[in-house]
C-alpha cells in the first residue's frame, strides 16, 4: 500500500538535488582557493540535516546553523551588492566586476541558487513531488528559511557603502515584502554601514524618468534614514551600456550618463 504523501502547492525538490549541491560545492571550492579546505561531503551532510525528516513547514534558522558554520566565508564587507527582482543583471555585473559580490557569489548562495528542496516529517526521503509554496502553504519552509538565514548574515557582514540593484520595470521598485525589503534592509548594521546606494535599472530604452523619485524609493530612503544610514540613488538608464562600460571603462562613450 503506497504511503499517503502530503501534496504541497509548490514544485518539488529539484531533480538530482544532492548531486547538484555536491557538484556545485566541488566546483566552487576548486575555483576559490580560500575555500579549498571545505569538505563538500560534510557540507552536504549539514545541508541534509537541516530539512530531511523535518516537517517542511516547521523549519527554523537554527536548523541551518551547522551548514552556516561550515560555509563561513569572509567577503570584503565594502564590496557587497544586494539586489531585488533583478538577479540576472546583478550576477552579470559581478562576473565582470570581480571584486564585488552578490550573495550567490558566496559558497552557500552558489550552492542553492535556483534550487528547490524539502523533505517529509519522520522519513529520510527527499520530496521530489511537491514542496510548500511561501504564500499558499507556509513561510517557514526549507527554501525560504535558508534564504532568510543566509541573506540576514550577508547583510550583517556588510560595511561602508553597500550597493543594491533594483528593477525599475516593476510596479514596486522597492518591495517591502522582498528578501531585500524584509530581511537585508533591516540587518544592515548602522555602526558599520555608512551609505546604501540604490541603482535603479531602467527597462525601456526611451525611459528617461527619474525613478529615484518613485514613491517606493522614497519609502526605502525613509526606512534607511531612520536606521541612521545615509541613502543615495542612481538611475541606470541603459543597463546594456552600463555593463559594457564596466567591462571597458576607457571607452569614450562611457563618460556620459548611463
Amino acid at each position: 500500500v503506497p504511503r499517503w504523501r502530503q501534496q504541497w502547492s509548490g514544485p518539488g525538490t529539484t531533480k538530482r538535488f544532492p548531486e547538484t549541491v555536491l557538484a556545485r560545492c566541488v566546483k566552487y571550492t576548486e575555483i576559490h582557493p580560500e575555500m579549498r579546505h571545505v569538505d563538500c561531503q560534510s557540507v552536504w551532510d549539514a545541508f541534509k540535516g537541516a530539512f530531511i525528516s523535518k516537517h517542511p513547514c516547521n523549519i527554523t534558522e537554527e536548523d541551518y546553523q551547522p551548514l552556516m558554520k561550515l560555509g563561513t566565508q569572509t567577503v570584503p564587507c565594502n564590496k557587497i551588492l544586494l539586489w531585488s527582482r533583478i538577479k540576472d543583471l546583478a550576477h552579470q555585473f559581478t562576473q565582470v566586476q570581480r571584486d564585488m559580490f552578490t550573495l550567490e557569489d558566496t559558497l552557500l548562495g552558489y550552492l542553492a541558487d535556483d534550487l528547490t528542496w524539502c523533505g517529509e516529517f519522520n522519513t529520510s526521503k527527499i520530496n521530489y513531488q511537491s514542496c510548500p509554496d511561501w504564500r499558499k502553504d507556509c513561510s517557514n519552509n526549507p527554501v525560504s528559511v535558508f534564504w532568510k538565514t543566509v541573506s540576514r548574515r550577508f547583510a550583517e557582514a556588510a560595511c561602508d557603502v553597500v550597493h543594491v540593484m533594483l528593477n525599475g520595470s516593476r510596479s514596486k521598485i522597492f518591495d517591502k515584502n522582498s528578501t531585500f525589503g524584509s530581511v537585508e534592509v533591516h540587518n544592515l548594521q548602522p555602526e558599520k554601514v555608512q551609505t546604501l546606494e540604490a541603482w535603479v535599472i531602467h527597462g525601456g530604452r526611451e525611459d528617461s524618468r527619474d525613478l529615484c523619485q518613485d514613491p517606493t524609493i522614497k519609502e526605502l530612503e525613509s526606512i534607511i534614514s531612520k536606521r541612521n544610514i545615509q541613502f543615495s540613488c542612481k538611475n541606470i538608464y541603459r543597463p546594456d551600456k552600463f555593463l559594457q562600460c564596466v567591462k571597458n571603462p576607457e571607452d569614450s562613450s562611457c563618460t556620459s550618463e548611463i
Epitope: A23, V26, Q41, W44, D45, A46, K48, G49, S53, I126
Partner: antibody, heavy 120, light 107 residues
Framework: QVQLVQSGAEVKKPGSSVKVSCKAS????????FSWVRQAPGQGLEWMGR????????NSAQKFQGRVTITADKSTSTAYMDLSSLRSEDTAVYYC?????????????WGQGTLVTVSS | DIQMTQSPSSLSASVGDRVTITCRAS??????LAWYQQKPEKAPKSLIY???SLQSGVPSRFSGSGSGTDFTLTISSLQPEDFATYYC?????????FGQGTKVEIK
C-alpha cells in the same frame, strides 16, 4: 544482484603501502558512494573514508589523513583504498561498503573483506 | 567527532527472549542511525536505518527506536541465527562512527 568483490589478502612490511580494490557489479556504480571500514582482530568497526566516483571526491577520518588515499575508477567500477606508512596496528580486515551519494541510508552492501597483515 | 556508546558490551540470552541493546550518541544525530549485525569472519549486514526503518529482507522481529542521542535495537524473540555482534553507526556527520559493539551470546 549487487556484489562488492575485494582483492585478496596481503602481507606487508612496516613502512610500506598497501592498495586494496573493491569491484562493484549489479548496480550503477556512479550512483553510489563507497566507504572503507576496517576491523582490527577482535575489535570493532572503524570508518576510514569515502569516495563519490561520480564527482571524483573523497574524504577521510582525520586519524588517517596524509596516509590514506581513496579513489575510484568509473571505467572499471572499482574503488580503491591506498594506505601508506604501514605499522603493526594497521593489521586488520578492510571492508568496502556502499551507500547512496546523498548518504540518506546505511551501508547496504559490503565487500567480503581483505585481511592486511603488517609484520616484519 | 561523535562518540557512539553501546550497552551492554555483551549479553547472554536464550532463544525466544526479548533482547534490547542501547546506543547513545555524544551529541544529537537526529535519526541518522543504522544498526548492523556481524557474525564471525563475515562482513556486517544492515538491519535498521534512519533509527527505525527496517532494511529490506530483515525479519520483523528486529526493530529500532529513538532519535537525538538515545537509540534502541530490540529483538522481540531471539532466534538461533541472531547470536552475533551488533553495532550502531551514526551517519549524521563525518567522520562516520560506530559503537564498540554488543555481543549476543547463548545462555
Amino acid at each position: 544482484q549487487v556484489q562488492l568483490v575485494q582483492s585478496g589478502a596481503e602481507v606487508k612490511k612496516p613502512g610500506s603501502s598497501v592498495k586494496v580494490s573493491c569491484k562493484a557489479s549489479g548496480g550503477t556504480f556512479s550512483s553510489y558512494a563507497f566507504s572503507w571500514v576496517r576491523q582490527a582482530p577482535g575489535q570493532g568497526l572503524e570508518w576510514m573514508g569515502r569516495v563519490i566516483p561520480q564527482l571524483g571526491i573523497a574524504n577521510s577520518a582525520q586519524k588517517f589523513q596524509g596516509r590514506v588515499t581513496i579513489t575510484a575508477d568509473k571505467s572499471t567500477s572499482t574503488a580503491y583504498m591506498d594506505l601508506s606508512s604501514l605499522r603493526s596496528e594497521d593489521t586488520a580486515v578492510y571492508y568496502c561498503a556502499r551507500d547512496d551519494i546523498a548518504a540518506l541510508g546505511p551501508f547496504d552492501y559490503w565487500g567480503q573483506g581483505t585481511l592486511v597483515t603488517v609484520s616484519s | 567527532d561523535i562518540q557512539m556508546t553501546q550497552s551492554p558490551s555483551s549479553l547472554s540470552a536464550s532463544v525466544g527472549d526479548r533482547v534490547t541493546i542501547t546506543c547513545r550518541a555524544s551529541q544529537g544525530i537526529s535519526s541518522w542511525l543504522a544498526w548492523y549485525q556481524q557474525k564471525p569472519e563475515k562482513a556486517p549486514k544492515s538491519l535498521i536505518y534512519a533509527a527505525s526503518s527496517l532494511q529490506s529482507g530483515v525479519p520483523s522481529r528486529f526493530s529500532g527506536s529513538g532519535s537525538g542521542t538515545d537509540f534502541t535495537l530490540t529483538i522481540s524473540s531471539l532466534q538461533p541465527e541472531d547470536f552475533a555482534t551488533y553495532y550502531c553507526q551514526q551517519y549524521n556527520s563525518y567522520p562516520r562512527t560506530f559503537g564498540q559493539g554488543t555481543k549476543v551470546e547463548i545462555k
